[in-house]
Interface confidence: low
C-alpha cells in the first residue's frame, strides 16, 4: 500500500481580520494510526495550534468529525483572526508510539495572510496658536494595519497638500504596521473655517479611505485691527468716541480705555458680530464730556487679544475746538454700549 501523504492543498489563504480562516488538510491513508497536530512555523520554536489528541483550543474547530474511524480530513477553522495569526501553518501526522507519539509526516504548509484595517487617522495640530503667514505642523497617525502598503494624503479645504513627510513602521516584517505623517500648512487670515484632512487608503478599505480632520479654528489666531473715531452727539459738550475692533479670532479679547495714559475702564468682548470668514468684530464707545476739560485729551483704546501683548490705537480729542467741528467717521457697527462721562 502507498505510504501516507499529508496534503495541504492551499499554498496560501487570505483572511480579513476578525473573520475565520479555514486551513485544509487531508491524509491519503488511515495507516499508520496516530493523531494529527497543527503548528504555526517549523523547527524547534514552532507554536502548537491544535492537537487532536489532547488540550483545549477554543479558537479552533475541526471541519469534520475527527472521532470517526475512517476520517482522513484534518482541516481546521481558526476564528476571530488577527494580524498576529499570520504565518505558515503545518498539518503534521504523528504515529502512535510509546511512551510518546512520533512525528511521521508533515504537509507542505499553508501561508496565512491577514488583512487588517488601519485605525481611524488621528490628526493633531500645534500646541499653541499661530498667526496668518506662519507655517504650522500637523501630525496624522494610524495603526494596526496589514499589509504594509498604504497611501496617505493631506488636504486643506479639498486641495491636496504636498509639503509632508510620512513614515511607516516598522521597516521590516511585522504582523501589523503604523503610519505617521507630518504636514506643513501656511496659515492665511481666511483660515478660521478651514479644515486639514488626513486621508488613509488601504487594501482593506475597499476604496473608501479613512479620514481624520483638524479644524484650523483651533490653531489660528487672527489679530485684530483697531480704529478709533469720534463723532458729535446732540449735546454740544459731548463727543462719542468709538473703538472698532475688527477681524479677530478667537473671541477672547479684553479692551481698556485710557485717558491721558490712565486706565479709565476695562471690559471684555461679549456681544460680538461674526464675519463670513469666521472672524469677529466688536465695538466699544465712550461718551466724553469735553466741557470738564481745559486741555486736550488723549484717548487710547488698548486691546489684549487671546493673551497676547496688548495693541493700542490713540485719538487726540481737541478740547479747544467746537465738538461738532471735529473730523468724524460714522461707526460701522454699534455692538458695545459703554458710556463714560469725563468731569
Amino acid at each position: 500500500e502507498e505510504e501516507l501523504q499529508v496534503i495541504q492543498p492551499d499554498k496560501s489563504v487570505l483572511v480579513a481580520a476578525g473573520e475565520t480562516a479555514t486551513l485544509r488538510c487531508t491524509a491519503t491513508s488511515l495507516i499508520p494510526v496516530g493523531p494529527i497536530q497543527w503548528f504555526r512555523g517549523a523547527g524547534p520554536g514552532r507554536e502548537l495550534i491544535y492537537n487532536q489528541k489532547e488540550g483545549h483550543f477554543p479558537r479552533v474547530t475541526t471541519v469534520s468529525d475527527l472521532t470517526k474511524r475512517n476520517n482522513m480530513d484534518f482541516s481546521i477553522r481558526i476564528g476571530n483572526i488577527t494580524p498576529a495569526d499570520a504565518g505558515t501553518y503545518y498539518c503534521v501526522k504523528f504515529r502512535k508510539g510509546s511512551p510518546d507519539d512520533v512525528e511521521f509526516k508533515s504537509g507542505a504548509g499553508t501561508e496565512l495572510s491577514v488583512r487588517a484595517k488601519p485605525s481611524a487617522p488621528v490628526v493633531s495640530g500645534p500646541a499653541a496658536r499661530a498667526t496668518p503667514q506662519h507655517t504650522v505642523s500637523f501630525t496624522c497617525e494610524s495603526h494596526g494595519f496589514s499589509p504594509r502598503d498604504i497611501t496617505l494624503k493631506w488636504f486643506k479645504n479639498g486641495n491636496e497638500l504636498s509639503d509632508f513627510q510620512t513614515n511607516v513602521d516598522p521597516v521590516g516584517e511585522s504582523v501589523s504596521y503604523s503610519i505617521h505623517s507630518t504636514a506643513k500648512v501656511v496659515l492665511t487670515r481666511e483660515d478660521v473655517h478651514s479644515q486639514v484632512i488626513c486621508e488613509v487608503a488601504h487594501v482593506t478599505l475597499q476604496g473608501d479611505p479613512l479620514r481624520g480632520t483638524a479644524n484650523l479654528s483651533e490653531t489660528i489666531r487672527v489679530p485684530p485691527t483697531l480704529e478709533v473715531t469720534q463723532q458729535p452727539v446732540r449735546a454740544e459738550n459731548q463727543v462719542n468716541v468709538t473703538c472698532q475692533v475688527r477681524k479677530f479670532y478667537p473671541q477672547r479679547l479684553q479692551l481698556t480705555w485710557l485717558e491721558n495714559g490712565n486706565v479709565s475702564r476695562t471690559e471684555t468682548a461679549s456681544t460680538v458680530t461674526e464675519n463670513k470668514d469666521g472672524t469677529y468684530n466688536w465695538m466699544s464707545w465712550l461718551l466724553v464730556n469735553v466741557s470738564a476739560h481745559r486741555d486736550d485729551v488723549k484717548l487710547t483704546c488698548q486691546v489684549e487679544h487671546d493673551g497676547q501683548p496688548a495693541v493700542s490705537k490713540s485719538h487726540d480729542l481737541k478740547v479747544s475746538a467746537h465738538p461738532k467741528e471735529q473730523g468724524s467717521n460714522t461707526a460701522a457697527e454699534n455692538t458695545g454700549s459703554n458710556e463714560r462721562n469725563i468731569y
Epitope: 492543498p9 485544509r24 488583512r115 502598503d149 475597499q206
Partner: antibody
Framework: EVQLVESGGGLVQPGGSLRLSCAAS????????MIWVRQAPGKGLEWVGI???????HYASWAKGRFTISRDNSKNTLYLQMNSLRAEDTAVYYC???????????WGQGTLVTVSS | DIQMTQSPSTLSASVGDRVTITCQAS??????LAWYQQKPGKAPKLLIY???KLASGVPSRFSGSGSGTEFTLTISSLQPDDFATYYC?????????FGGGTKVEIK
C-alpha cells in the same frame, strides 16, 4: 490613482510564444494577490491563473504547463508567459487585483492576443 | 477543480423588473463567491463579494445571497444601465473559476 495597464498582445502564429505585461501604478504589486483572466471573442470570462503574495502560483487545469505567471517587484509589473499557443487561446487577456475581503476590484483594460497563421 | 454553473444564460427583462440569477458550485465554497457586471469591450466590475457584501460604489438595488453551493444575485428594480452580462466567480482554496455568464437584455 490605482491602475493596471496590460500590454504585449498582438498577432502570433500557432505554436509561438508571447509575454503579456501588466503594469501597476498607485500600489505595490508585491502586497496583493494578482489574477489573469481571459475572454475569447463573444465568450465568457475564463480564469487563467493567480500569483500570491508569497510568489506561489496556481493555474486553471488547461493552463498548467503552457502558461506561467511571474512578477517583477522592482518594475511593479505582473507577467503572463504563454507558450505553445493555439488558435483557441485567441482572447482579450485581463489582469486583476484581489480585494482583501474577496473578489477582484481593480482590472486592467485588457490586451488582445490573436493566434492565427 | 471547482466548476461554476450559472443560469439562465440569457434573461429578457424590462426596466423596473426584479431579476434573479443563480450560480451553483460543484463543491462547498462556503461564502467565497463574487459577482461581476461586464459591458461589451470593458473589464468586469465587482458588484458583490463574500456572497452577500456590496462592493464600494455599487447601488443598493444589487444584492447577493447563499452559501455552500447555491448562490443568487438579485437586482430589485432593473435600471437602463443594468443591461449587461453578469458572472459569478469562486475564490475558494486555490481555484478561481467563473460561471458561464448571464446576459440580461431588454425585453
Amino acid at each position: 490613482e490605482v491602475q493596471l495597464v496590460e500590454s504585449g498582445g498582438g498577432l502570433v502564429q500557432p505554436g509561438g510564444s508571447l509575454r503579456l505585461s501588466c503594469a501597476a501604478s498607485g500600489f505595490s504589486l508585491s502586497n496583493y494577490e494578482m489574477i489573469w483572466v481571459r475572454q475569447a471573442p463573444g465568450k465568457g470570462l475564463e480564469w487563467v491563473g493567480i500569483i500570491y503574495v508569497s510568489r506561489s502560483t496556481h493555474y486553471a487545469s488547461w493552463a498548467k504547463g503552457r502558461f506561467t505567471i511571474s512578477r517583477d517587484n522592482s518594475k511593479n509589473t505582473l507577467y503572463l508567459q504563454m507558450n505553445s499557443l493555439r488558435a483557441e487561446d485567441t482572447a482579450v487577456y485581463y489582469c486583476g487585483r484581489y480585494l482583501a475581503s474577496g473578489g477582484f476590484n481593480i482590472w486592467g483594460q485588457g490586451t488582445l492576443v490573436t493566434v492565427s497563421s | 477543480d471547482i466548476q461554476m454553473t450559472q443560469s439562465p444564460s440569457t434573461l429578457s427583462a424590462s426596466v423596473g423588473d426584479r431579476v434573479t440569477i443563480t450560480c451553483q458550485a460543484s463543491h462547498n465554497i462556503y461564502s467565497n463567491l463574487a459577482w461581476y457586471q461586464q459591458k461589451p469591450g470593458k473589464a468586469p466590475k465587482l458588484l458583490i463579494y463574500d456572497a452577500s457584501k456590496l462592493a464600494s460604489g455599487v447601488p443598493s438595488r444589487f444584492s447577493g445571497s447563499g452559501s455552500g453551493t447555491e448562490f443568487t444575485l438579485t437586482i430589485s428594480s432593473l435600471q437602463p444601465d443594468d443591461f449587461a452580462t453578469y458572472y459569478c466567480q469562486s475564490y475558494y482554496g486555490n481555484s478561481y473559476p467563473f460561471g458561464g455568464g448571464t446576459k440580461v437584455e431588454i425585453k
